[in-house]
């Protein structure tokens, strides 16, 4: 378990020409919310599908009223992180999509309105304990800058948060098997808590609350041997009364599984999957019915009113199984054309094309300017199986269609002075600075003989030393 | 925070090349603007060349025609390629990032070349 965390560190008008027009107006005063949803995995699901991950909200911002006049500025956020706990291991990869919202504070009819300012997306590999992560999206005109991480609850540690630590009982060690707790070096990692009365001998648990028989042992508990002999358990702990660790058959000899069941080996122990009609850790269980809910992921029960019938799961899409409990990989086809990733989301199968391809399978090849109409003047330029406006001057967007001023987003560091150009803007740069925005120090020490910095020190700002 | 790591440096003879890279910690390092710095003993550090986040480059006099500076965002990095190497070319070569979130520099811990016969 463990909290993901995001904090916003602006909102406003991205660098470059065509500078958004403020969301707020002296008539119509607003403030901004954000709204965050998480996904495990890379899947780059529709904006509509469930939050599997979490979701959260964040409070009201302050209330804006825009100046008449003055561009648009960051706008003014509200307080606090956003935070969205999860229960589970923590994936390590995950998609975000991250709203921005206005609510208009004038004189409605009904209350406040809200309107969906912004939307941005992306999927990104993070480990649970790490630092904050930085980040820059762009949405239209729009710039959302913010920083995220996920860190664990106590007592669950690591990267996925599935690691439990507990201060040390003993001074100068561990327990038996169990390491330290790295980076908690004075504690341990604990066992996992599994089903309360599992057996301690005979059962164990990869998820908190379950508890797993080792070969020779079953009952929901573990405590009831499935044969008199008590050397069934060879591959696991030996038996606390006997000592006994005899080198003996795997865990699928002989075939634990009962009622047709077919068997494979797990690092643990053993897995049983079971025919309609019986489940359990050894298939011993019979008399399902639809009322027991035997079908996972979504399948529809049918038939299987009372214990003497069998009932059947109907699966759907991208499940199978006789309880639709696994998963169909239908990417393996490779279903996608011309390099399209493809992206197995449940529900359906997506093709995400390559630039320049189009289609449910990414079969058709695009002629990046064909029907792409550019406004006030410009022209499409093709390339790299995109296209983009060469815009006429004065305007920019990505179809030329927003009066820009380049100006608008203070682009030049340093004191840099900005002037509007015929070919976008110039950056007249104070002395000792170079680069097309001023950002490059040409000495960036007033001493000689500056000691390296290490790495990501900032020796200072440069304008200190000019 | 943005962590700079410099390699590629050594020892080259008058004349040779050689292809220094710097990688960047940065998540979104498209915006960044990326240079390099070189500082001899006992003198200043100074601008080698520089690359903006739009792509538009910039060398200083001294090595104009014989540096080249290029990125490749996708590798979060930057590449000072050296030709035609001289004796006072020999410095300690530093990374640099303008980072324009915050307005703020970052430096690497620096790779030294040497050019000697």
């Known amino acids: 378990a463990g909290v993901f965390e995001l904090q916003i560190h602006s909102f406003g008008p991205g660098p470059g020409p065509g500078a958004p027009r403020s969301p707020c107006s002296a008539r119509l005063p607003c403030r901004l919310f954000f709204r965050v949803c998480l996904k495990p995995g890379l899947s780059e699901e529709a904006a509509e599908s469930p939050c599997a991950l979490g979701a959260a909200l964040s409070a009201r911002g302050p209330v804006y009223t825009e100046q008449p006049g003055a561009p648009a500025p960051d706008l003014p956020l509200p307080d606090g992180l956003l935070q969205v706990p999860f229960r589970d291991a923590w994936p390590g990869t995950f998609s975000f999509i991250i709203e921005t919202w206005r609510e208009e504070l004038g004189d409605q009819i009904g209350g406040p309105a809200w309107s969906l300012l912004a939307r941005v997306a992306g999927r990104r590999r993070l480990a649970a304990g790490g630092p904050w992560a930085r980040d820059i999206q762009r949405a239209g005109a729009w710039e959302l800058r913010f920083s995220y991480r996920a860190r664990c609850e106590p007592p669950a540690v690591g990267t996925a948060c599935t690691r439990l630590c507990r201060p040390r009982s003993a001074p100068s060690r561990c327990g038996p098997g169990l390491r330290p707790c790295a980076p908690l070096e004075d504690e341990c990692e604990a066992p996992l808590v599994c089903r309360a009365g599992c057996s301690p001998e005979h059962g164990f648990c990869e998820q908190p609350g379950e508890c797993r028989c080792l070969e020779g042992w079953t009952g929901p508990l573990c405590t009831v041997p499935v044969s008199t002999s008590s050397c069934l358990s060879p591959r696991g702990p030996s038996s606390a009364t006997t000592g006994c660790l005899v080198p003996g058959p795997g865990p699928c000899d002989g075939n634990p599984c009962a009622n047709g069941g077919s068997c494979s080996e797990t690092p643990r122990s053993f897995e049983c999957t079971c025919p309609r009609g019986f489940y359990g850790l050894r298939c011993e269980v019979s008399g399902v019915t639809c009322a027991d809910g035997p079908c996972f992921n979504g399948g529809l029960c049918v038939g299987g009113a009372d214990p003497d019938s069998a009932y059947i799961c109907h699966c759907p899409p991208g499940f199978q199984g006789s309880n639709c409990e696994k998963r169909v990989d239908r990417c393996s086809l490779q279903p996608c054309r011309n390099g399209g990733l493809c992206l197995d989301l449940g529900h359906a199968l997506r093709c995400r094309c390559r630039a320049g391809f189009a289609g449910p399978r990414c079969e058709h090849d695009l002629d990046d300017c064909a029907g792409r109409a550019c406004a006030n003047g410009g022209t499409c330029v093709e390339g790299g199986g995109a296209h983009r406006c060469s815009c006429a001057l004065g305007f920019g967007g990505r179809d030329c269609r927003e009066r820009a001023d380049p100006c608008a987003a203070r682009p030049c560091a340093h004191g840099g002075r900005c002037y509007a150009h015929f070919s976008g803007l110039v950056c007249a740069c104070a002395p000792g600075y170079m680069g097309a925005r001023c950002e490059f120090p040409v000495h960036p020490d007033g001493a000689s003989a500056l000691p390296a910095a290490p790495p990501g020190l900032r020796p200072g700002d440069p304008q200190r030393y000019l | 925070e943005v962590q700079l790591v410099e390699s590629g440096g050594g020892l080259v003879q008058p004349g040779g090349s050689l292809t220094l890279s710097c990688a960047a910690s940065?998540?979104?390092?498209?915006?960044?603007?990326m240079a390099w710095y070189r500082q001899a003993p006992g003198k200043k550090r100074e601008l080698v060349a520089g690359?903006?986040?739009?792509?538009?480059?910039v060398y200083v006099d001294s090595v104009k025609g014989r540096f080249t500076i290029s990125r490749d965002n996708a590798k979060n990095s930057v590449y000072l390629q050296m030709n035609s190497l001289r004796a006072e070319d020999t410095a300690v070569y530093y990374c640099?990032?303008?980072?324009?979130?915050?307005?703020?520099?970052?430096w690497g811990q620096g790779t030294l070349v040497t050019v000697s016969s």
């Open positions: 640099y990032a303008y980072e324009w979130t915050n307005a703020l520099p970052y």
């Open positions: 940065f998540s979104a390092v498209a915006y960044l603007s």
């Open positions: 690359i903006s986040d739009d792509g538009s480059t």
